[in-house]
């Protein structure tokens, strides 16, 4: 089974692809 999605758990339901952005999260390792 193929998957184009890693996880939608943290995604807000958007009305289309026009508002989607790639989010880079910084890890706090201090």
């Amino acid at each position: 089974v193929k998957s184009k999605i890693g996880s939608t758990e943290n995604l807000k339901h958007q009305p289309g692809g026009g508002k989607v952005q790639i989010i880079n999260k910084k890890l706090d390792l201090s």
Partner: antibody, heavy 120, light 112 residues
Framework: QVQLVQSGAEVKKPGSSVKVSCKAS????????ISWVRQAPGQGLEWMGE????????YYNEKFKGRVTITADKSTSTAYMELSSLRSEDTAVYYC?????????????WGQGTLVTVSS | DIVMTQSPLSLPVTPGEPASISCKSS????????????LAWYLQKPGQSPQLLIY???TRESGVPDRFTGSGSGTDFTLKISRVEAEDVGVYYC????????FGQGTKVEIK
């Protein structure tokens, strides 16, 4: 395998309501949007609206706002589309489709369709 | 609302010959952040539910024959069939998902 199984054909009177169901299996129901699309006899495809089952969040085609309600029951992996104040122009085949929300935003699996006939 | 316009609306084809369908949107479908065009192509064979052929304007859905190719960006898109086969007959729809969803009117492909 992924399957979307819709409820059977309906005959309704003008002014009444219809509720069509779409039972999903073979994937995690909460992870994908369910869209509803209709097709009048001999006509093209028309998007009605969608629901993200995890949150219950919905978006609707302005044309149907106030007349259509889309809901989802996570416990049974079933989505519903209710259309009210039916008129003869609502006679159509109604499809549910799994929408790859979050990436391709494309409908990769479709139900078999439900014919709704509105007639007095 | 985003309006999708397909042409031609009817396309008689000869098996083995190429075919091309155009789809134009009233506004750009390109997300500059993701660098994706939110345009998909579907085929509805007679008596069947629609099936996904292409998404992101040019990415073939798994299982779709490589004779189907999608191209274009922004507002102008094209679906090409390199060599039409009898099983390719039906109605082809483009659909935008940049904002909500809108389908084109459909292009009926039939064998000459």
């Amino acid at each position: 395998q992924v399957q979307l199984v819709q409820s059977g054909a309906e005959v309704k009177k003008p002014g009444s309501s219809v509720k069509v169901s779409c039972k999903a299996s073979g994937y995690t129901f909460s992870d994908y949007v369910i869209s509803w699309v209709r097709q009048a006899p001999g006509q093209g495809l028309e998007w009605m609206g969608e629901i993200f089952p995890r949150s219950g969040s919905t978006y609707y085609n302005e044309k149907f706002k106030g007349r259509v309600t889309i809901t989802a029951d996570k416990s049974t992996s079933t989505a519903y589309m209710e259309l009210s104040s039916l008129r003869s122009e609502d006679t159509a085949v109604y499809y549910c489709a799994r929408d790859y929300y979050g990436t391709s935003f494309a409908m990769d699996y479709w139900g078999q369709g439900t014919l709704v006939t509105v007639s007095s | 609302d985003i309006v999708m316009t397909q042409s031609p609306l009817s396309l008689p084809v000869t098996p083995g010959e190429p075919a091309s369908i155009s789809c134009k949107s009233s506004q750009s479908l390109l997300n500059s952040r993701t660098r994706k065009n939110y345009l998909a192509w579907y085929l509805q064979k007679p008596g069947q539910s629609p099936q996904l052929l292409i998404y992101w304007a040019s990415t073939r859905e798994s299982g779709v024959p490589d004779r189907f190719t999608g191209s274009g960006s922004g507002t102008d898109f094209t679906l090409k069939i390199s060599r039409v086969e009898a099983e390719d007959v039906g109605v082809y729809y483009c659909k935008q998902s940049f904002y909500l969803r809108t389908f084109g009117q459909g292009t009926k492909v039939e064998i000459k």
